[in-house]
Interface confidence: low
C-alpha cells in the first residue's frame, strides 16, 4: 500500500510545486520525493523497505497521478542510494536519494528546489508546505491530484515531551505540529519547504496522523548536507 | 479529427474589452492543456496564456497579465480568453492551441486553429 | 525572459537541397524547444519537440538537433511544400518564447 497522506489539507494548485515527485512502485505511487538536481530526487530510505524486485520509478511535472498532463514524465531509477546509517527500526537518517535514468527535462512544471545547506533550525512557528498523494482521510480515500497543507513548525523540547515523541526528536529531526492538519508516513520523502526552500523531508515511520499529541517527524536536509553533496557529486 | 475553431474577433478601441471563444472537436477537451499564442503582423509569435485541463492552474507572460484572463468550460468544450484595456500592440491574429500529452512530457504545442483577427485601433 | 535568436530572417534554396535552420537560446534551455512549420495562409504545425523527436506524420527529411542554447533543424531533399516560415519554442520556463521566424525560400 502506498506509504503516505496530507490529512486536513487541499488540493494543490496544478502544477505550482514542479519539484514535487512521485515514487512508484510497479506502476503506482508509493512515497513523495522531491526534485533536488537535474538528474537526483530526494525521498525517505524506508520507502524502497517493502520494494523487493519491483520495479521502482519516479513520476514528475504530475498534479493528476491518472490524467493526461503535458509535462508528465515517469523516469526510471538507475541507482538508489539511501543514507548508509538508515535502519528499519529507526526514524534516524531516513533518506535516500534517486538517480533518474537520464536528466530531467525541466519545464515550468518541472524544477528542482533549491535546499537548505545552513545547519540551523526553522523557527518554531513558521508556517511550512507539506504536499503529497497519500490518502487524505482515515478511511483510506487516496487523492488522484496533489494535496497540500500549511503546518507551524514545533519547538524540539516541545516535540521530545515524555507525552509526544519522548526524547527521540534529534538535532537532525524536526517537528511539525499535527492538530488535524497533518502528513502520515507515505507523504514520507515528500518535501517540507519553508519560504521557498526545503527544509525538511518526511520521514516514514508508523505513527498516528492528525493527532496533535504526536506531531509530524521530518528529516532536516541541511544536517545531511555533506552526504548529499557527496552522492550527486 | 482534432479541430480548434477561434472566433470573437473584432475591432476595437484602445481600452476597450473583447472576449474571444475556442470551440474544441475531436479530442477529449478536459484531457488536454491549452494556450493562446498570437501572431503580430510582422509574423512573430508570442505565447500570451496557459490553462490547465480543470483550469486550476493558469499562466500569463508580464505582457498581459492583469489584462488578459483566460477560462475554460470543459462541459462545452471551449476555451475562452477575455481581453480588457486593450492596447494597439495587442493586435494580433490570435490562436488556440493544443498541449499534447506526450510520452516526454512537454509544453508544445500539436494542434493549433485557424486564428482570428484582433485589431486594437481608434 | 529567454529570448529565441534565429539569426536568419531569409534562407534560399533549391528543391532537392540540404538546409539547416539555426535558433539559438538566451540560457540554457536542456533540449526542451520545437520547431513549427507555417505554410502560407496557414497555421502553425508542430515538427519536432525535445529538440529532436519528429512529431507523429512529419516527414523524416526534417531532422532537429542540439541541446543547451544552440540548436538547428535540418530538412534534406527541400521539397516545393517545404518553402514556408519555422519557428522555434523554448518551454524550459515561463513565459513559453518563440523565434523571430526563418522564411525558407526558392533561390
Known amino acids: 500500500p502506498p506509504r503516505g497522506r496530507i490529512l486536513g489539507g487541499r488540493e494543490a494548485e496544478a502544477h505550482a510545486r514542479p519539484y514535487m515527485a512521485s515514487v512508484q512502485l510497479n506502476g503506482a505511487h508509493l512515497c513523495g520525493g522531491v526534485l533536488v538536481a537535474e538528474q537526483w530526487v530526494l525521498s525517505a530510505a524506508h520507502c524502497l523497505e517493502d520494494a523487493a524486485d519491483g520495479k521502482v520509478q519516479v513520476l514528475l511535472g504530475a498534479h493528476s497521478l491518472s490524467q493526461p498532463e503535458p509535462s508528465k514524465r515517469l523516469y526510471d531509477v538507475l541507482r538508489a542510494v539511501p543514507h548508509p546509517d538508515s535502519q528499519p527500526d529507526t526514524i534516524d537518517h531516513d533518506l535516500l536519494l534517486l538517480q533518474l535514468s537520464e536528466k530531467a527535462t525541466l519545464g515550468p512544471a518541472v524544477r528542482p528546489l533549491p535546499w537548505q545547506r545552513v545547519d540551523r533550525d526553522v523557527a518554531p512557528g513558521t508556517l511550512c508546505d507539506v504536499a503529497g498523494w497519500g490518502i487524505v482521510n482515515h478511511a483510506g480515500r487516496r487523492p488522484d491530484s496533489l494535496q497540500h497543507v500549511l503546518l507551524p513548525v514545533l519547538d524540539r523540547a516541545t516535540c521530545n515531551r515524555r507525552t509526544h515523541h519522548d526524547g527521540a526528536i534529534t538535532e537532525r529531526l524536526m517537528c511539525a505540529e499535527s492538530n488535524r492538519r497533518d502528513s502520515c508516513k507515505g507523504d514520507s520523502g515528500g518535501p517540507l519547504v519553508c519560504g521557498g526552500v526545503l527544509e525538511g523531508v518526511v520521514t516514514s515511520g508508523s505513527r498516528v496522523c492528525g493527532n496533535r499529541k504526536k506531531p509530524g517527524i521530518y528529516t532536516r536536509v541541511a544536517s545531511y548536507a555533506a552526504w548529499i553533496d557527496s552522492v550527486l557529486a | 479529427e482534432v479541430q480548434l475553431v477561434e472566433s470573437g474577433g473584432d475591432l476595437v478601441k484602445p481600452g476597450g474589452s473583447l472576449k474571444l471563444s475556442c470551440a474544441a472537436s475531436?479530442?477529449?477537451?478536459?484531457?488536454?492543456?491549452m494556450s493562446w499564442v498570437r501572431q503580430i503582423p510582422d509574423k512573430r509569435l508570442e505565447w500570451v496564456a496557459i490553462s490547465s485541463r480543470d483550469n486550476s492552474f493558469t499562466y500569463y507572460p508580464d505582457s498581459v497579465k492583469g489584462r488578459f484572463t483566460i477560462s475554460r468550460d470543459n462541459a462545452k468544450n471551449t476555451l475562452y480568453l477575455q481581453m480588457s484595456s486593450l492596447k494597439s500592440e495587442d493586435t494580433a491574429l490570435y490562436f488556440c492551441t493544443r498541449h499534447p500529452y506526450l510520452p516526454t512530457g512537454g509544453y508544445v504545442m500539436d494542434y493549433w486553429g485557424q486564428g482570428t483577427s484582433v485589431t486594437v485601433s481608434s | 525572459d529567454i529570448v529565441m535568436t534565429q539569426s536568419h530572417k531569409f534562407m534560399s534554396t533549391s528543391v532537392g537541397d540540404r538546409v539547416s535552420i539555426t535558433c539559438k537560446a538566451s540560457?540554457?534551455?536542456?533540449?526542451?524547444v520545437a520547431w513549427y512549420q507555417q505554410r502560407p495562409g496557414q497555421s502553425p504545425k508542430l515538427l519536432i519537440y525535445w529538440a529532436s523527436t519528429r512529431h507523429t506524420g512529419v516527414p523524416d527529411r526534417f531532422t532537429g538537433s542540439g541541446s543547451g542554447t544552440d540548436f538547428t533543424l535540418t530538412v534534406s531533399n527541400v521539397q516545393s511544400e517545404d518553402l514556408a516560415d519555422y519557428f522555434c519554442q523554448q518551454y524550459t520556463s515561463y513565459p513559453l518564447t518563440f523565434g523571430a521566424g526563418t522564411k525558407l525560400e526558392l533561390k
Open positions: 540560457q540554457d534551455v536542456g533540449t526542451a
Open positions: 475531436g479530442f477529449t477537451f478536459s484531457g488536454y492543456g
